[in-house]
């Protein structure tokens, strides 16, 4: 017998063809021999089965010898062997209906787990293979689990259910609620304005919640809250802000913070936490601030950086248009009795300049 796989909620067409391409008597019955539908004269008649209100046939194809049965809004319990009786012969079609659903809301926070559950008819032994938008393949039986969702898991998951060499494909849209970046670093010269941006990796029609930026300055012994805020329908309202620094926050998304001046005492790292209404858990983005200061005091030219820098970063003092350079993989470099001219302090990573500050050394007569 022929096997046909269907999807819960979908429509399936079970075909039955007569050898004669003409209108003739036919009946569709279920495995209990209960009539579902058939032809009486020129009219479609329906039997007492549970399917009667969801079953139909393509009348336009009857005169071509095609006596298909269409079942709408499929249910798992529609799985059965259906018999088409036409021209004194019986054609059997086994219909297996599957459903694949996410156990929870399909809007999940980064790090949360996703469980997909397969509904299948009794006696079937299907296998499921899912492919994430990022190309990750996961296999399973009745359930498929993704223990820790990542932001690249956002999008349409394609899951293939296989049974008796037949397949049916499901598409499930998953939205991973996360910031676009897990971490970002801002490099600034002392005194410059600092802009922190926290773009989200998703869009929701109504976005409501609350958040906080918690900051650990490199020079401070303990961390503290820099700003707390509420988010109502994508509108940001500041709840409380520290007095030093005097932070400002944008009123619209993406979340945007402005620090009027980069100062050594602010250099450090922060964690912006966002709690969304009706969601368990919080979104996090780490942000780092690195501040550079170049100073000349008496016979000493010094360049310093504060904040989280990796050990492989190089700090250099270089005299413009001259070869004189001092470089160190350290957070401070200095030159004693520097030559007059424009000196550059450079913070670089494998030759790529991240931050530079110029200081003019005037000749001492």
């Amino acid at each position: 017998k022929k096997v046909v796989l269907g999807k819960k909620g979908d429509t399936v067409e079970l075909t039955c063809n007569a050898s004669q391409k003409k209108n003739t008597q036919f009946h569709w019955k279920n495995s209990n021999q209960i009539k579902i539908l058939g032809i009486q004269g020129l009219f479609l008649t329906k039997g007492p089965s549970k399917l009667s209100d969801r079953a139909d046939s393509r009348k336009s194809l009857w005169d071509q010898g095609c006596f298909s049965m269409i079942i709408k809004n499929l249910k798992i319990e529609d799985s059965d062997t259906y018999i088409c009786e036409v021209e004194n012969k019986k054609e059997e079609v086994e219909l297996l209906v599957f459903g694949l659903t996410a156990n929870s809301d399909t809007h999940l926070l980064e790090g949360q787990s996703l469980t997909l559950t397969l509904e299948s008819p009794p006696g079937s032994s299907p296998s499921v293979k899912c492919r994430s938008p990022g190309g990750k393949n996961i296999q399973g039986g009745r359930t498929i689990s993704v223990p820790q969702l990542e932001r690249q898991d956002s999008g349409t998951w394609t899951c293939t259910v296989s049974q008796d060499q037949k397949t049916v494909e499901f598409k499930i849209d998953i939205v991973v609620l996360a910031f676009q970046k897990a971490s970002s670093t801002v490099y600034k010269k002392e005194g410059e304005q600092v802009e922190f941006s926290f773009p989200l990796a998703f869009t929701l029609e109504k976005l409501t919640g609350s958040g906080e930026l918690w900051w650990q300055a490199e020079r401070a012994s303990s961390s503290k809250s820099w700003i707390t805020f509420d988010l109502k329908n994508k509108e940001v309202s500041v709840k409380r802000v520290t007095q030093d620094p005097k932070l400002q926050m944008g009123k619209k998304l993406p979340l945007h913070l402005t620090l009027p001046q980069a100062l050594p005492q602010y250099a450090g790292s922060g964690n912006l936490t966002l709690a969304l209404e009706a969601k368990t858990g919080k979104l996090h983005q780490e942000v780092n601030l690195v501040v550079m200061r170049a100073t000349q005091f008496q016979e000493n030219l010094t360049c310093e950086v504060w904040g989280p820098t990796s050990p492989k970063l190089t700090l250099s003092l270089k005299l413009e248009n001259k070869g004189a350079t001092v470089s160190k993989q350290a957070k401070a470099v200095w030159v004693l009795n520097p030559e007059a001219g424009m000196w550059q302090c450079l913070l670089s990573d494998s030759g790529q300049v991240l931050l530079e500050s110029n200081i003019k050394v005037v000749p001492t007569w």
């Epitope: 919640g209 503290k224 409380r240």
Partner: antibody, heavy 119, light 107 residues
Framework: EVQLVESGGGLVQPGGSLRLSCAAS????????MSWVRQAPGKGLEWVAN????????YYVDSVKGRFTISRDNAKNSLYLQLNSLRAEDTAMYYC????????????WGQGTLVTVSS | DIQMTQSPSSVSASVGDRVTITCRAS??????LAWYQQKPGKAPKVLIY???SFQSGVPSRFSGSGSGTDFILTISSLQPEDFATYYC?????????FGQGTKVEIK
């Protein structure tokens, strides 16, 4: 180590006044909002008032508005609560607490000072 | 003012039991909710802030959940040192308000 030590409690007659103090140490006092919370004998906690870092913003529970005044002296690392027109229902243990926790939580509390209003 | 209603007002439980305390706000408070533990004669101490985040040093048997107006504090396996009174508190709007407390007693 963060420490908050309240003082100034005692027995006072209805209509009388008291000034509670809270001496802070072990942290940069001027960087934090501070709160007063009270607890009547055998009862639950009631938030009374709070004050921002420089004393320019103050908030009170309705039942004490116009009678109690919160203030601070950052030079002395001290928080104060002036209690006037005291009533029997103001009898409670008064705690000072630092609003230094994440999500505006009260992360450090003093051991409290008892105020008894009775004739 | 936002009213915070805790239930139950007291619960008798044994060591190892799972205890659940609920807190309902009279209006939405987003995630501005903290839970405190208070032992007799002592000052309260914060257990959980922002609905579900642990204060450092708080054992993982304590957990918080909920959103909007309904919140839960769960102690997964009650320990002898957990017998105390627990309070929820909102910091969404002034005046800040506490629940009336839930006393966890030894059965």
């Amino acid at each position: 180590e963060v420490q908050l030590v309240e003082s100034g409690g005692g027995l006072v007659q209805p209509g009388g006044s008291l000034r509670l103090s809270c001496a802070a140490s072990g942290f940069t006092f001027s960087s934090y909002w501070m709160s007063w919370v009270r607890q009547a004998p055998g009862k639950g906690l009631e938030w009374v008032a709070n004050i921002n870092q420089d004393g320019s913003e103050k908030y009170y529970v309705d039942s004490v508005k116009g009678r109690f005044t919160i203030s601070r002296d950052n030079a002395k690392n001290s928080l104060y609560l002036q209690l006037n027109s005291l009533r029997a229902e103001d009898t409670a243990m008064y705690y000072c607490a630092r609003e230094g926790g994440q999500w505006l939580s009260l992360d450090y509390w003093g051991q409290g000072t008892l105020v008894t209003v009775s004739s | 003012d936002i009213q915070m209603t805790q239930s139950p007002s007291s619960v008798s439980a044994s060591v190892g039991d799972r205890v659940t305390i609920t807190c309902r706000a009279s209006q939405g408070i987003s995630s501005w909710l903290a839970w405190y533990q208070q032992k007799p004669g002592k000052a309260p101490k914060v257990l959980i802030y922002g609905v579900s985040s642990f204060q450092s040093g708080v054992p993982s048997r304590f957990s918080g959940s909920g959103s909007g107006t309904d919140f839960i504090l769960t102690i997964s396996s009650l320990q002898p040192e957990d017998f105390a009174t627990y309070y929820c508190q909102q910091a969404n709007s002034f005046p800040w308000t506490f629940g009336q407390g839930t006393k966890v007693e030894i059965k």
